[in-house]
Interface confidence: medium
């Protein structure tokens, strides 16, 4: 039975040319995380595999950095980066958990950022 839940940074916005950290958090399960995929709509951005480490898709290598932690940092943002991003946690024995983040890249010099996770 899948007992875990995914928390995400939710809807976030950032300035054109800036950078943003995408974060998801899997909680309430002791399942082994074997791999985390980061996807933008139908494109694979990056994979973090427990045994093989990080792989960044070649087309995003210049603008995507792994981390912090299992998160993903997007750099040199353009308006075309606006859209849905998904973190896909592959776990054993639970299966797959998916979180969704919507990023809006703004032209203006003032962008309101989504709330960061609070640490207990």
């Amino acid at each position: 039975m899948m007992t875990g839940t995914i928390e995400t940074t939710g809807n976030i916005s950032a300035e054109k040319g800036g950078s943003i950290i995408l974060q998801c958090h899997l909680s309430s399960t002791t399942a082994q995380v074997t791999q985390v995929n980061w996807e933008q709509q139908d494109q694979l951005l990056a994979i973090c595999n427990a045994d093989l480490g990080w792989h960044i898709s070649p087309s995003f290598k210049d603008r995507v950095a792994p981390g912090p932690g299992l998160g993903l940092t997007l750099q040199s943002l353009t308006v075309n980066d606006t859209g849905e991003y998904f973190c896909i946690y592959h776990t054993y024995p639970d299966g797959t958990y998916t979180g969704r983040i919507f990023l809006e890249v703004l032209e203006s010099s003032v962008a309101e950022h989504g709330a960061r996770f609070q640490i207990p």
């Epitope: 958090h25 995380v33 595999n49 480490g53 981390g67």
Partner: nanobody
Amino acid sequence: EVQLVESGGGLVQPGGSLRLSCAASGRTFSFMGWFRQAPGKEREWVASVLRGGYTWYADSVKGRFTISADNSKNTAYLQMNSLKPEDTAVYYCAREGSGYASDYWGQGTLVTVSS
């Protein structure tokens, strides 16, 4: 029940070294992380290690700290060299959920860097 127990903290002079250990019982995890919280500041991510031995670090500790894990002992380590006063904090190990959040935390071990 999952338990994470840190040890190895203490008082050290600037430029000195310490090795922290984090023993996991009840369940091992594919991703382990070290975090720290300085007085009056938010908890911050320090370093992570994957089951396969892959590691990554916060910029502030890169080149000075080394994270590792012994899967057979269910233990993660943080070797801290060239310590600075600004490294003073309570250090926590955690099951990685992301860069800043985890649902399994240890109780922390205090590292004080002072002359």
